[in-house]
Every structure is written in structure tokens, then in C-alpha cells.
């Protein structure tokens, strides 16, 4: 019995087609992805093949103005239109709190939304009961397939799930649910979830009875043969894991941003064994036409976005200096504003020991593309912020050793004075450079704000300590020559859309007046 699994993950609000790098579409003939194009391909496959499932492995939320404005209603609407069969909860589905998940998505989705390792407690338990499920048995042709969901147990550190959701270990939580499916005589089981490729592989290895793992979170690109675009494969598609009980379990993921549609064909025998598995992600490029009815719907929903981008978010009473003449040479108040917003966006999980889980921010000065003049009545709009941060990136959470941070700050000034983008703006960090010293030895003082303290204060950076840092995904991926970050990071979790982080902060503060205050000397 042959099953075709179509899958997406980490779409991050890319409802409209995008450029090849998943930023705003400029030249339509070269654009990719988007729900209208995805629908065309999905329908083509549904017509051609008998047993098809369309699955999403989480993180539909967060990433463009679509999410900022529609707050998840757009996800429910267009996923319903595409007739998704199931979705797993990702960490970003909790970005607007549990209410921001329940109302727009859980209550509106016409497909099951899954996670076996999220347990509700207290007053939330009855409120959310039945709105998401640990598993769902889906009829497919003459057969049934069990889908069991999972979500990163790091979600409380990455998003805002509140205090009434407990995120259990994925493997511990999945095993009893898979066992339950087996007792229901369901012998074809897909684990669909959002914990990253390493955890996906562990699930394939450790959870008895899981036949296929469809993952997300790590934006992993797998491909067999010559890849069709710029993404470099992390392995073959599917990636085969040998389970502890001796079975070959295919593991798949489909990069991110709706650029590809994962396409996996599985042949099962009567016992539910995977006899063969093959496929590849399908690049959703302009050779696939956008479906006209979905496209018309997108255009209808778009109108509200254009109105939103000119509305006032808040006011500034000072000039926001985002000029390259400042931000690539010295501390600039636009850099301070953005870093403060980045830390503020990650305020969560205080306890008796820690006032917050992260206190530090770094930001390449070259990523700040425009100032904002306060003389326009002080008004700040989304449009203004899009000029400052035009690349459509995210502000991510990484874990780095102190020694890596020290290398990053040396790189920041290794060719100082040439107006290059690698000069770092900071938050929760005090750095002193001596530019008379030779490159690679210019950082003379590097103090960082403590997190394990009731009164935050600056302490010298310890080379062997592991620190959490918020930074642009561009830096996490080694951009502007920060190869040491990419090579040495110990953990990397994708965060929220950059403009959204700053706009939310400005809306919260209402009036802002960031200063140059001696963070960089």
C-alpha cells in the first residue's frame, strides 16, 4: 500500500510568493512559494495519486506582516483552503500566548492540530480540551494512518506558552501514544512534529512503532541528487535512521518558508512495515503557476496589510540614528533601540535564581539600513521600520561559549574604519576596544549583564561559560564574516520577525527616547 506524504514546515507567514531567499518578492517571474502556488502542486498530486496526506510540522505563525496583522486567522483560513490533513504545534504558535493560538487557529482549523508532549493544567485544561490532540487516526483510501504530534520542549524559552502548559520530553510522551495507536490496530504511524532534526532522528531511533518522522524547527534541507536551488542538503531525502528495534525509519524535513513542498512516497506492507521510501522536496518555483482562486483570495486579504503599514505604532521624541556613518563606527541609538527590543521580546521564565534566561544582544551595524527622523510628528510606522530592517530576517536565540563571543567582538573591529557592516551594536554588554592594538587583539574589556542575579549588573565575560545571546539570523548563519558564530554555536533556535519585534516594543513603550549611553567605548 503506497502512501504519499506532502509536507511543509516553518512556513513563517509566507502566504505570498517570495524571492529565492524567502524575502519580499520583487521580480514575480523569479519568485517562489506562497499558498497559491503550493495549492496548484498539491492538487496536481492529489489528482494523480490515490493515497495522499498533506501535513504541516509547525511554525506557520510569525515571520511577515501577514502574522502581525492577522495574528493567525490567515493561517487557519489558507490552511483550510488547502485542505491540510494535520498540523503539529510549533514553538511560534505560542508567540501571542495561548489565547493567540486558541482563538484564531485551534478553534478555526478544520484539520487536527497535534502535540503529544504538551499537557495543559489548571484552568486552561478544560478551556483547551479537545482543541489540540496527542494523535489523530486518519482514513486514507482503504487504510488508516495514525499521526502523532510533538513540539519542542524548549518552547517556554522560545515563546509565550504561559504557566499552564507543561512541555514534556518528546520521546517519553510519544511512546505511550504510539502504544495506544497500536492497541487500536493502527500499524502505520507518522510522528509529525517541531523539535529539530536531531530530535527527529532520536524519535526515529527510540520510539517503538513510529514508521516515519516528519519534522521541522531546524529548517533542515534534505535532498537526493543535485539540489535545485541555493540550499545545501544536510543529508539525503529521506534521511534513514536505523531504530533500536532494527527497522529503517525515514526522517524528512522540507527546509522552510514554503519554498519547497516535501514529497515522500512510502510503500507499506500489511503489517505496517515500511518496505520502501523515496522522494524529494519539490521546489515551488515560477514553473508552477499560482492557483487563480487562491491568488484572488490572497489579494483580497492583502488590502488590510497595505493600510496597516502606514498606521502609527508609537512615537519617538529623539532622532533615531540608523545612519551607516554612526552604526558602522560607534554605538548608535538605533542599535540600542533594536537590541533593547530584542531583549524585551525574550523576557520570560523569571524564577528565584534568574531574572531572565537571556540578557545579551548583538547586532551587526550593517543590518541597520535607515534612520528615523523624529521631526515627522515623532510618528513611527511599520513602513519606517521596514526601511530600517528591510531584509525580513529574524532575531534568534543562540548559545555560545564566552570564547566565541570574544572572537566575535574581535571580528567586529578587525578592519575598523572602512564602514563595513560587521561592527556590532549591543545590549546587555559593555565592550571597550583599543584600536591602536593589532587586529585580533583589540578587545580590552568585555563585561556582560548577569542573568542569575536579582539585581542585574555587569561582570567580566568568562571564556568557558556558556551564554545565551539574541542576534539576527544573519549573524547566526555566519553572515558579515562571523563564521565563528556559525561554527561554534552550541544551540540555535529561530526567533521572531525582526520588524515585528521592534514594532511590538515601540507599541508597548508608546514613546521612545533611546540614548547613546556608553555600551561601546
Amino acid at each position: 500500500w503506497e502512501l504519499t506524504i506532502l509536507h511543509t514546515n516553518d512556513v513563517h507567514s509566507r502566504l505570498e510568493q517570495t524571492s529565492e531567499d524567502s524575502s519580499k518578492c520583487v521580480n514575480a517571474s523569479r519568485c517562489m512559494g506562497g499558498v497559491a502556488r503550493l495549492f496548484t502542486k498539491v492538487q496536481q498530486i492529489r489528482r494523480a495519486e490515490p493515497n495522499v496526506l498533506l501535513l504541516d510540522a509547525g511554525d506557520q505563525y510569525q515571520g511577515t506582516i501577514w502574522f502581525t496583522v492577522y495574528k493567525g486567522a490567515e493561517v487557519a483560513h489558507f490552511m483550510n483552503a488547502l485542505r491540510y490533513d494535520a498540523m503539529a504545534l510549533g514553538n511560534h504558535e505560542f508567540d501571542n500566548g495561548v489565547e493567540g493560538l486558541i482563538e484564531p487557529l485551534l478553534k478555526e482549523a478544520k484539520f487536527p492540530i497535534l502535540s503529544a508532549n504538551i499537557k495543559a493544567k489548571g484552568p486552561l485544561a478544560s478551556q483547551i480540551s479537545g482543541l489540540y490532540l496527542p494523535y489523530k487516526v486518519l482514513p486514507v483510501g482503504d487504510e488508516v494512518v495514525g499521526i502523532v504530534g510533538y513540539t519542542s520542549k524548549e518552547t517556554p524559552f522560545l515563546s509565550n506558552p504561559g504557566t499552564n502548559l507543561v512541555f514534556e520530553d518528546e520521546i517519553t510522551a510519544l511512546q505511550p501514544e504510539v502504544d495506544k495507536l497500536k492497541t487500536l490496530n493502527v500499524n502505520k504511524i507518522i510522528a509529525l512534529g517541531h523539535s529539530g532534526f536531531e530530535t527527529d532522528k532520536l524519535i526515529a531511533q527510540k520510539v517503538r512503532g513510529v514508521d516515519v518522522v516528519v519534522g521541522g524547527h531546524s529548517n533542515t534541507f534534505l535532498y537526493t541528487g543535485n539540489p535545485p536551488s541555493k540550499e545545501v542538503p544536510a543529508g539525503k531525502y529521506p534521511f534513514i535512521v536505523t531504530s533500536d528495534d532494527g527497522r529503517k525509519v525515514p526522517v524528512v524535513q522540507a527546509y522552510a518558508f514554503g519554498k519547497y513542498l516535501g514529497y515522500l512516497k512510502i510503500e507499506f506492507d500489511e503489517r505496517g512495515n515500511v518496505i520502501s521510501s523515496h522522494g524529494n522536496p519539490i521546489l515551488l518555483n515560477s514553473s508552477i503557476p499560482e492557483d487563480p482562486s487562491i491568488k484572488a483570495d490572497i489579494n483580497k486579504w492583502r488590502i488590510k496589510l497595505d493600510n496597516y503599514s502606514t498606521q502609527e505604532l508609537g512615537k519617538t521624541i529623539v532622532y533615531l540614528d540608523g545612519s551607516s556613518q554612526s552604526c558602522r563606527f560607534r554605538e548608535c541609538n538605533m542599535g540600542n533601540l533594536i537590541c533593547d527590543a530584542m531583549i524585551n521580546n525574550n523576557l520570560r521564565h523569571a524564577d528565584e535564581m534568574f531574572w531572565n534566561h537571556v540578557s545579551m544582544c548583538i547586532l551587526n551595524g550593517g543590518g541597520i539600513r535607515s534612520p528615523i527622523d523624529e521631526r515627522n510628528n515623532g510618528t513611527i510606522t511599520w513602513e519606517n521600520l521596514a526601511a530600517v530592517l528591510p531584509f525580513g530576517g529574524t532575531f534568534d536565540l543562540v548559545q555560545l561559549k564566552g570564547s566565541t563571543l570574544k572572537k566575535a567582538f574581535e571580528h567586529s573591529v578587525h578592519r575598523y574604519g572602512q564602514s563595513t557592516g560587521e561592527f556590532l551594536q549591543v545590549g546587555g554588554i559593555h565592550v571597550v576596544y583599543d584600536l591602536s592594538r593589532k587586529p585580533g587583539d583589540r578587545v580590552v574589556k568585555l563585561d556582560v549583564l548577569c542573568t542569575k542575579c536579582r539585581v542585574p549588573s555587569y561582570d567580566p565575560l568568562k571564556m568557558d561559560e556558556i551564554y545565551k545571546v539574541i542576534l539576527p539570523n544573519f549573524l547566526a548563519n555566519g553572515g558579515d564574516g562571523f563564521q565563528m558564530i556559525k561554527d561554534e554555536l552550541l544551540r540555535h533556535d529561530s526567533g521572531d520577525q525582526d520588524i515585528n519585534v521592534v514594532s511590538t516594543y515601540i507599541s508597548k513603550m508608546k514613546v521612545i527616547y533611546p540614548a547613546v549611553e556608553g555600551r561601546i567605548k
Epitope: 487504510e143 506492507d269 500489511e270
Partner: antibody, heavy 114, light 107 residues
């Protein structure tokens, strides 16, 4: 649990035909196909062909084409294998086996003797 | 048709021995290979499917490996109940074909 139960032993004369049945249970019968395999006394296994239950599609080994007919009765989840123009070398145990031979019938002995 | 050449055709071994049986295909069959066990009474049982996946209930002393045209069944420590005849089967292309069998006997 998958189970395949075959019909009883048959003794046939050369030139005659034999029809062996295989009743399946414990799985979604229409979603899969069934194989027929035979084993002559003291010999190895020989694949004869397969039938897809849902559509009745068949694929026969060239060696048996024209002599073998595989059919299906979906209402009783039963597959049949008929072999015609029997000769002495068709004396063998005939097995039905699920799609990728994960489960086997108990075998049906067919003896061709004058 | 794809020919499957199985070797050895028979072998004698003692309990606890490591036993290796090989199947060579006349052309590349990908991973499309099963290993079957037939006990003297005639009952057939699949041990390994898709070259290396172990059927449920099959002891972990059985393992399969290989690719392309060369495939191997290994019994890491032979047990009394393992004395039987073993067959490989390729299902990469029609007609499916079996190896000639390997009879494992008590030394």
C-alpha cells in the same frame, strides 16, 4: 493479526486444472496484493505472480503465462490461483503470501499423477 | 530476469557460531531484498525486509546488510532453533526471484 488460510491438498491428472484458494483476514484486504509461490519437492521457492485485490490487476511470471489465472473475491477476502494443463513437474506445495511475503499461508500440496 | 545466486548452498555450524549467508544479484536491486527462513516442517517466515529491517518478533541476532548487488544475512550467535533453510528474495523487478537457499545444519 494477519492470517492466510489455504484450501486442502489436491491430486490431479496430467492435463487437468487445479484451483487453490487463500482466505485472508486481519488486515485491509483491498489495499494490498497477494503473491503465489510454489516449491517442488526438495527444491527451492519459485514466484508465480501476484494479484492486486482492489482492481484485480495481475502480473504473472513468464514461465506460467497462459496457464495461470489469479482472481479475487473481495466479498470473502479470498484469492484464487488456477493452474491449467497440469504436468507432473507441477507437483509442488503452493503458497499464497502477502504483498512483501511478510505472511504466508500454510501451503497446499498439489500432486499431478496419472 | 534477475538471477539471485545464494552461497553457500549448505553449511554446518555449532550453537554459538557466527553464520554469514550471501546473495549476489545479477543486477542492482537497490534495497529490495528480503530474507526468509523455512523450518523443516515447511513453514515460511520473513526475517528481514528491505535489506536490513528486522521483522517484529525476530531476534536481534539476525541482521541484514548490503547494497547494489551484494547482500548478506548474518546470525551473530547461532541458536538451536535457527537450524533451517534460508532464502533471499529480490522484489526490485518482475518476476520476483529467490536465491537457491542455504541449509544450515548442526555440526
Amino acid at each position: 493479526e494477519v492470517q492466510l488460510v489455504q484450501s486442502g491438498a489436491e491430486v490431479k491428472k496430467p492435463g487437468a486444472s487445479v484451483k487453490v484458494s487463500c482466505k485472508a483476514s486481519g488486515y485491509t484486504f483491498t489495499a494490498y496484493f497477494m503473491n503465489w509461490v510454489r516449491q517442488a519437492p526438495g527444491q527451492g521457492l519459485e514466484w508465480m505472480g501476484r494479484i492486486y485485490h482492489n482492481k484485480g490487476d495481475t502480473f504473472y511470471s513468464q514461465k506460467f503465462k497462459g496457464r495461470v489465472t489469479m482472481t479475487v473475491d473481495k466479498s470473502t477476502s479470498t484469492v484464487y490461483m488456477e493452474l491449467s494443463s497440469l504436468r507432473s513437474e507441477d507437483t509442488a506445495v503452493y503458497y499464497c503470501a502477502t504483498s512483501y511475503v511478510g505472511d504466508w499461508g500454510q501451503g497446499t500440496t498439489v500432486t499431478v499423477s496419472s | 530476469d534477475i538471477q539471485m545466486t545464494q552461497s553457500p548452498s549448505s553449511l554446518s555450524a555449532s550453537v554459538g557460531d557466527r553464520v554469514t549467508i550471501t546473495c549476489r544479484a545479477s543486477q542492482d536491486i537497490g534495497d529490495s531484498l528480503n530474507w526468509l527462513q523455512q523450518k523443516p516442517g515447511g513453514a515460511l517466515k520473513r526475517l528481514i525486509y528491505a535489506t536490513s529491517s528486522l521483522d517484529s518478533g525476530v531476534p536481534s541476532r539476525f541482521s541484514g546488510s548490503g547494497s547494489g548487488t551484494e547482500y548478506t544475512l548474518t546470525i551473530s550467535s547461532l541458536q538451536p532453533e535457527d537450524f533451517a533453510t534460508y532464502y533471499c528474495l529480490q522484489y526490485a523487478s518482475f518476476p520476483w526471484t529467490f536465491g537457491g537457499g542455504t541449509k544450515v545444519e548442526i555440526k
